[in-house]
């Protein structure tokens, strides 16, 4: 596993500062509050109109 600032995590994974390694975005289904889930594109952001009615 690479350190932050070097090569990015492989497709489908994201860096976890908490665990100090790349983690699978698939695990965000069970652990959505994990720090690395912010870096996962598993769920696209809500449309602008939903954020600002």
């Amino acid at each position: 596993e690479q350190a932050p600032g070097t090569a990015p995590c492989s497709r489908g994974s994201s860096w976890s500062a908490d665990l100090d390694k790349c983690m699978d975005c698939a695990s965000c289904r069970a652990r959505p509050k994990s720090d690395f889930c912010l870096g996962c594109a598993a769920a696209p952001p809500a449309p602008f109109r939903l954020l600002w009615p």
């Epitope: 665990l19 983690m23 698939a26 289904r29 069970a30």
Partner: antibody, heavy 119, light 111 residues
């Protein structure tokens, strides 16, 4: 290097009790859910119980066969997980493994501890 | 509970050839993005070891001879070319919901 050491197995009579222990090292124990999985020739690999994190209020989940008889617990200060087994039956005879999981995968397995329930 | 059915129960493959193991789930274990299926290897006298996670992602240190595929209810583990050290029993496992369940295992023998 990840290490998992199960202990506490042995021979016990039907209806008896036994407490299994697992000491872990080499990974951030407090951030991983912990599981007990057993293996027997009759039933193959069978998930038994899971305990989650302090932030989850140490939520526990059990296989139907373990509900009401088995209790999983953990001691984060000792990086240990336990399985208290009561009212043991012949069908509980198996090798018992502890295994950490972050979410979906049982990433590491110990060597297992053998439990035999027989009169 | 989700039932995982593995086939064949055992197979013998010549050194250097391909081994193919199937795992069928009684219901889908996939979202549109990920499949919640794992594969484990258990060599004789040893504990199980994680090989493949999320249907197709090799765990760290696992040789590229191993590959996984599938989605929904049908999953496959391929080993090519097989080596002597691949003599083992292989298990699939889902993490779609509780209880987690395992397949019955497939014993691979190298000829």
């Amino acid at each position: 290097e990840v290490k998992l050491g199960e202990s506490g197995g042995g021979l016990v009579q039907p209806g008896g009790s036994m407490k299994l222990s697992c000491v872990a090292s080499g990974f951030p124990f407090t951030k991983y859910w912990m599981n007990w999985v057993r293996q027997s020739p009759e039933k193959g690999l069978e998930w038994v119980a899971e305990i989650r994190l302090k932030s989850d209020n140490y939520a526990t989940h059990y296989a139907e066969s373990a509900k009401g008889r088995f209790t999983i617990s953990r001691d984060d200060s000792r990086s240990s997980v336990y399985l208290q087994m009561n009212n043991l039956r012949a069908e509980d005879t198996a090798i018992y493994y502890c295994s950490p999981t972050y979410a979906d995968t049982m990433d590491y397995w110990g060597q297992g501890t053998s439990v035999t329930v027989s009169s | 509970d989700i039932v995982l059915t593995q086939s064949p129960a055992s197979l013998a493959v010549s050194l250097g050839q391909r081994a193919t193991i199937s795992c069928k789930a009684s219901q889908s274990v996939s979202t549109s993005t990920y499949s919640y299926m794992q594969w484990y290897q258990q060599r004789p006298g040893q504990s199980p070891k994680l090989l493949i996670k999320y249907a197709s992602k090799l765990d760290s240190g696992v040789p590229a001879r191993f590959s996984g595929s599938g989605s929904g209810t049908d999953f496959t583990l391929n080993i090519h070319p097989v080596e002597e050290e691949d003599t083992a029993t292989y298990y699939c496992q889902h993490s779609w919901e509780l209880p987690y369940t395992f397949g019955g295992g497939t014993r691979l023998e190298i000829k």
